[in-house]
């Protein structure tokens, strides 16, 4: 019922060895159980964080400490809503070799989204 699930950016290119944080916004649900999926397999994320923006709006994070080749792929988040699984638009994570400059692409219809936060 009016569930809105978003992830951003649509394409993300990062340097190997860098940390990355993906985020996913869920609107229209109280206390969503946000799951992250990579290439069809659920990503176990024992220390996952949420930000409750409001009762009906939550943001979930997936933190990758140090990205390597095996982390490249298609990520999305999903939630159960009334017995059905709703999935977000996928985020494509691609890698460039360590030390190369990475470009972060996202489509403007997701401009309400900040980039995933990078930390050193």
């Amino acid at each position: 019922a009016g569930l809105k699930l978003m992830g951003a950016p649509v394409k993300l290119t990062v340097s190997q060895g860098q940390p990355v944080k993906l985020n996913c916004s869920v609107e229209g649900m109280e206390e969503p159980d946000i799951q992250w999926v990579k290439d069809g397999a659920v990503v176990q994320n024992l220390d996952q964080l949420y930000i409750p923006v409001s009762e009906q709006h939550w943001i979930g994070f997936l933190s990758l400490k140090s990205v390597e080749r095996s982390d490249a792929g298609r990520y999305w988040c999903q939630v159960e809503d009334g017995g059905e699984t709703e999935i977000s638009q996928p985020v494509w994570l691609t890698l460039v070799p360590r030390g190369s400059s990475a470009h972060h692409h996202h489509h403007h219809h997701h401009s309400a989204w900040s980039h995933p936060q990078f930390e050193k």
Epitope: L46, Y50, I51, S63, K65
Partner: antibody
């Protein structure tokens, strides 16, 4: 103020069943996971497992899978650790810990900071 | 099953720098956390996500991580820092957490 109140110390015989509890207050229970940690007398900490904030999914450490059951009752903001058949080697202090979950910012570690005082379980014939 | 390896004990004189290491194959991919546990007390979070100091922890405590090794450093150790220190992290697939065996820090 965040508080995790654990049930009192217990002495049981081998083969007995036992459930210990951890009642949370001072925050929204369904915003966080709860983990359980074991510490045998004079020994180190061991992560046993955790239950997610919806009380719908549990994860266990390899040494504890099948030997204990973690559950939670959202209506009373209480997490539980249960044994069907205790062994002498279960004698230990058991801590509950508020784990991952809601935060006021993407990396602010409100998780793992709040521990219960521990419940001492003694299993002896 | 996955293991985190710490030295059983470290001794320093007051004012010296204490370094406690934690070794684990997944540490290049998974964050390390450090706990301090004083005798008869519940553990206290000292460092999270490799290097970030938890609230209320003195500046003399710092953390770092490189490759398969995480390190807790106490610059100018004080007598009140005597405690057991545990590192804590996830196994590589994120299926479960693990504590290191613990390091007893003596400041004498």
């Amino acid at each position: 103020e965040v508080q995790l109140v654990q049930s009192g110390a217990d002495v049981k015989k081998p083969g007995a069943s036992l459930t210990i509890s951890c009642q949370a207050s001072g925050y929204t229970f369904t915003d966080y996971w709860i983990s359980w940690v074991r510490q045998k007398p004079g020994k180190g900490l061991e992560w046993m497992g955790q239950i997610n904030r919806h009380a719908s999914n549990t994860m266990y450490g390899p040494s504890f899978q099948g030997h204990v059951t973690i559950s939670a009752d959202r209506s009373t903001a209480t997490a539980y650790l249960q044994w069907r058949s205790l062994e002498a080697s279960d004698t230990a202090m058991y801590y509950c810990v508020r784990s991952g979950g809601a935060t006021s910012g993407g990396t602010i570690p409100e998780y793992y900071q709040h521990w219960g005082p521990g419940t001492l379980v003694t299993v002896s014939s | 099953s996955y293991e985190l390896t710490q030295p059983p004990s470290v001794s320093v004189s007051p004012g010296q720098t204490a370094r406690i290491t934690c070794s684990g194959d997944a540490l290049p991919k998974k964050y390390a956390y450090w706990y301090q546990q004083k005798s008869g007390q519940a553990p206290v979070l000292v460092i999270y996500e490799d290097w970030k100091r938890a609230s209320g922890i003195p500046e003399r405590f710092s953390g770092s991580s490189s490759g398969t090794m995480a390190t807790l450093t106490i610059s100018g150790a004080q007598v009140e820092d005597e405690a057991d220190y545990y590192c804590y992290s996830q196994e590589r697939k994120g299926n479960y957490f693990v504590f290191g065996g613990g390091t007893k820090l003596t400041v004498l």
